[in-house]
Each structure stands twice: as C-alpha cells, then as structure tokens.
C-alpha cells in the first residue's frame, strides 16, 4: 500500500519515506512544502535557514560523506541517494559482499578463509610484506629503517636485504668491523663488537663464544599461539594448538569474524600478481 504522508503535504513538491512525514523537493519549503524558496539573495536553495538573513544556507546533501561502502559511487536522486556498487558488492550502501574464496580475492599469496559472520564472506591473511583487506598493498618495511649504521635497505618481497656502509657488516649492518677484524663465528654466526672483545651472535641451534656448541632451538619459544616445540636433528618442529597452522603456528585456521568489510579493488580480476 502507498505511504500516507502528512495531511496537506503537497503532492507535487513533497514526498515521504515514513507515514505522517512531509519532505520537500529542492526549491520548496514549509511544513507542507507549499512555499517556494526565494533564490534572489541566497546562494543555495537547499538547507536550513540562516538566523541573520532568513536565507537558506547550504546543508548536508544525501551523498555528503559518501554513504556508499566498498568503493561504491553515490549519486543523488529526487528522494534520496543511490549507490553504484563495484563488482562483487551489492545492497543499498554496497555493504554486502558477494565475493567468496572461490573467486580468489586474496592477492600476493594471501590465504583466504571463509568469514565467521554472514556480513563477511571471506578474510585474507596476508603474507609478510603485504596488507589490506585483499593483500593488495605492499608494506613499506624499509620505512621502519631496519638497517643500522646508515645501511641501505632493499625490500626483496620475501625478505629484506641491508647493504652496509664501509666499516659495518651483518644482516642488519649491526656489527662494527673494527672489533671483529680477523675474528670468525662458526655455524653461520655473526660477529658483534663489544668493548675490544668480540662476541658472536649465533644462528638458530648454536651457542657458545664462537657458536661451536649446539643450543636448544626451542629455548627462544619459536612456536606461536601456544604451539609446542620439539627439537630434533634437523632443527625444530612446532605442534600447533587447535585452530592454528603453519611452520611456526602463525596462521589461524578459523579466525574471529571481522567487522571491517573487505574491499575488493575495483576492476581487479581474481589472480595473484607475483612479486
């Protein structure tokens, strides 16, 4: 049944979205939308009246602040607004995602899992170096200035690489070579300066002054999310707690439902642009 507007509401210049309401079309005002707006000395025919001049001042339009989510574009209609949604989204405000993991929405090697709540059809777990709801944004890890002593940082995608200034060495250029000249650390260890005496920073599984002694690889608690660590001849193995997976139990199998809606970049087809 058609809505019954406020009694006397102008059928030509007014409309309603709820019973008993009378909302005016552009250029008309008054409780029943029967008063034409004077535009002679006013900048805008829409909006609340100015207390000093009686003129109407610009008010918020239905598209102000863009009510359309997920990259939808807003256009004003005589009665309200309309959202044009990107591929994969629908709803009054493009708030519903039609994309699922089957569409391959996670880029750059992101792991896709089904969302835990109905509003979230999927969630992307991004690999190191990528972020965004679809893992579409590369993280600028070099902006954190991880290379010490003025070293140059290169983001290789799968890892970082530091190129060191003269007199420095090590994976992060953290070692002053003056102290370590002629010194060597065994088993992939790196030499660290320290008040005239050298010290070795040992690779996983080794310890001692020169990294010649076998160390417990589980001592550093490498297994995340409560995973149990087991040492064996070739290193360590993580036995993950229920709900987690990965070499270090770093990935949730069933992550908590996220309220933030994933945004599929417009025009992108499912696929994985390799780095």
């Amino acid at each position: 049944a058609p809505l019954v507007c406020r009694a006397g509401c102008s059928p030509e210049h007014g409309f309603c979205e709820q019973p008993g309401e009378c909302r005016c079309l552009e250029g008309w005002t008054g409780p029943l939308c029967t008063v034409p707006v004077s535009t002679s000395s006013c900048l805008s025919p829409r909006g609340p009246s100015s207390a000093t001049t009686g003129c109407l001042v610009p008010g918020p339009g239905p598209c102000d602040g863009n009510p359309c989510a997920n990259g939808g574009s807003c256009s004003e209609t005589p009665r309200s607004f309309e959202c044009t949604c990107p591929r994969g989204f629908y709803g009054l405000r493009c708030e519903v995602s039609g994309v699922t993991c089957a569409d391959g929405p996670c880029f750059n090697g992101g792991l896709c899992v089904g969302g835990a709540d109905p509003d979230s059809a999927y969630i992307c777990h991004c690999p190191p170096g990528f972020q965004g709801s679809n893992c579409e944004k590369r993280v600028d890890r070099c902006s954190l200035q991880p290379c010490r002593n003025g070293g140059l940082c290169l983001d290789l995608g799968h890892a970082l690489r530091c190129r060191c200034r003269a007199g420095f060495a090590g994976p992060r250029c953290e070692h002053d070579l003056d102290d370590c000249a002629g010194r060597a650390c065994a088993n992939g260890g790196t030499c660290v300066e320290g008040g005239g005496a050298h010290r070795c920073s040992c690779a996983l599984g080794f310890g001692g002054r020169d990294c010649r002694e076998r160390a417990d690889p589980c001592a550093a608690r490498p297994c995340a999310h409560g995973g149990r660590c087991y040492a064996h001849f070739s290193g360590l193995v993580c036995a993950c707690a229920p709900g987690y997976m990965g070499a270090r139990c770093e990935f949730p199998v069933h992550p908590d439902g996220a309220s933030a809606l994933p945004a599929a970049p417009p025009g992108l087809r499912p696929g994985d642009p390799q780095r």
């Epitope: 190191p128 890890r141 991880p146 200034r165 420095f168 992060r172 992939g188």
Partner: antibody, heavy 128, light 112 residues
C-alpha cells in the same frame, strides 16, 4: 654435521627433461634459501634459482625462467626441474644454502647475500 | 643484472709470497661481496663475506678489502694448499623487482 647432497644427474638426450634433488641434513631447513648453481667444465659458477624455505618464495635468473623450476618437496629436500635440455646445459649442478637471519621484533627476515654451504654437485651431461 | 669482473685470470707466486686478486662490480654494491675458493673436483668454499669478514676456520692469511665497486682479496704467506681458483660473488636487486646472484669469472692461483 651440516650437509647437502645432490642426486639425479647423468647422461641425457637433447630435448629431454630432468629433475635434480637436493637433500639437507644436520641443520634447520627454515630461515634459509636453498639454491641451485651450475658450473660448466672449465667455467665459473652460474646461479640458477633459489627457494626461500619459510614461505616458499622462488626467484630465478632471467635466463632460467621458463625452463628451470625450483620446488620444495619436503621439510629437508628441494628439487630443480629442467626441461628442453641442450648441450649448453652440460655442467655440474650444485645445491647451495643462502642463510637468512631473523631478529625478535624485526619486520622481516634478512637475506645474507652469500652461500655458506654447498653440496658436492651432480654432473649432468647432455649428448646424443 | 650486475656484472662481476675479476682480474687477473691467472696468477703465479712462490710459497711464502703474496697474491692480490681484484674484483670489480658494474654498480655500487656497498660491502655486499663474498669470496670463494674452489679446488678441482670440489664445490666452492666460502672464504669471506661482507667484503672482509672471514668465515670460521679460514686462516687470517686471507684478507679482504674494498667498498662500492672495487674489491680486493689478498693471500699472504702463500702455502701450497692455497693453489685453487678464487671467485668473487655479489647479490643484486634490479628496479624490476628481481633478486639474484652473480659470480666473477675466477682467478686461478698457481703456487710454485
């Protein structure tokens, strides 16, 4: 004792395919890249490809793309698949480890840029 | 991709003498240079990395220096066991996003 051992080499016909295997022992396979380097008789070493064990990222020389594929097949083994072999591919193929280093709170692992452990190599001869 | 050029291709010296090998990179690699020793029938063995940091077990008769594009490996108090071919190596990262490794052509050291 840290060790790499290659296998799968031998005499093959031109145009054939071959899969070489590298088995590691005595060290933690993670936080390392396992790489393949070849050396033709009387020539210098030539890098082919690597695979970073932590996330499976593979990277290869521009000339090797398409014909050479590196894969991690288990927690202690990697393979190199070669297709369309020619006489120019005759060489000793080495498996080599390039270490990566991790730091607590650091944003990523850090590549070392060198090879600190090599296997003895496996000879591949391409001839009809 | 980067090009590593080694000189000389071959050098001869007497026991107890000194040998100097040069390596030139086609672009600035800071200190990202490694040196390897290879004997016939064996794989290359890492001698030093970061231009001058000796690997464990390598005698201090071996020393490295250089920065940027010019690097040097010096072997002093030469021994018969030092007879081998020596290679320099660096890694590269191109603007196209490709990462890789490049070796020099090698220098054969003959000990008299």
């Amino acid at each position: 004792q840290e060790q790499l051992v290659e296998s799968g080499g031998g005499l093959v016909q031109p145009g054939a395919s071959l899969t070489l295997t590298c088995k590691a022992s005595g060290f933690d396979f993670t936080s390392n890249a396992m790489c393949w380097v070849r050396q033709a008789p009387g020539k210098g070493p030539e890098w082919i490809a690597c695979i970073y064990n932590d996330d499976g990222s593979a990277y290869s020389a521009s000339w090797a793309k398409g014909r050479f594929t590196v894969s991690k097949t288990s927690s202690t083994a990697v393979t190199l698949q070669v297709t369309g072999l020619t006489a120019a591919d005759t060489a000793t193929y080495f498996c080599a480890r390039s270490p990566y280093y991790t730091y607590g709170g650091a944003p990523s692992a850090y590549a070392s840029g060198y090879f600190n452990l090599w296997g003895p190599g496996t000879l591949v001869t391409v001839s009809s | 991709d980067i090009v590593m050029t080694q000189t000389p291709a071959s050098v001869e010296a007497a026991v107890g003498g000194t040998v100097t090998i040069k390596c030139q990179a086609s672009e600035n690699i800071y200190n990202s240079l490694a040196w390897y020793q290879q004997k016939p029938g064996q794989p290359p063995k890492l001698l030093m990395h970061d231009a001058s940091v000796l690997t464990s077990g390598v005698p201090s008769r071996f020393s490295g220096s250089g920065y940027g594009t010019e690097f040097t490996l010096t072997i002093s108090d030469l021994e018969c066991a030092d007879a081998a071919t020596y290679y320099c190596q660096s890694d590269y990262y191109s603007t196209g996003g490709s990462y890789g490794f490049a070796f020099g052509g090698g220098t054969e050291v003959v000990v008299k």
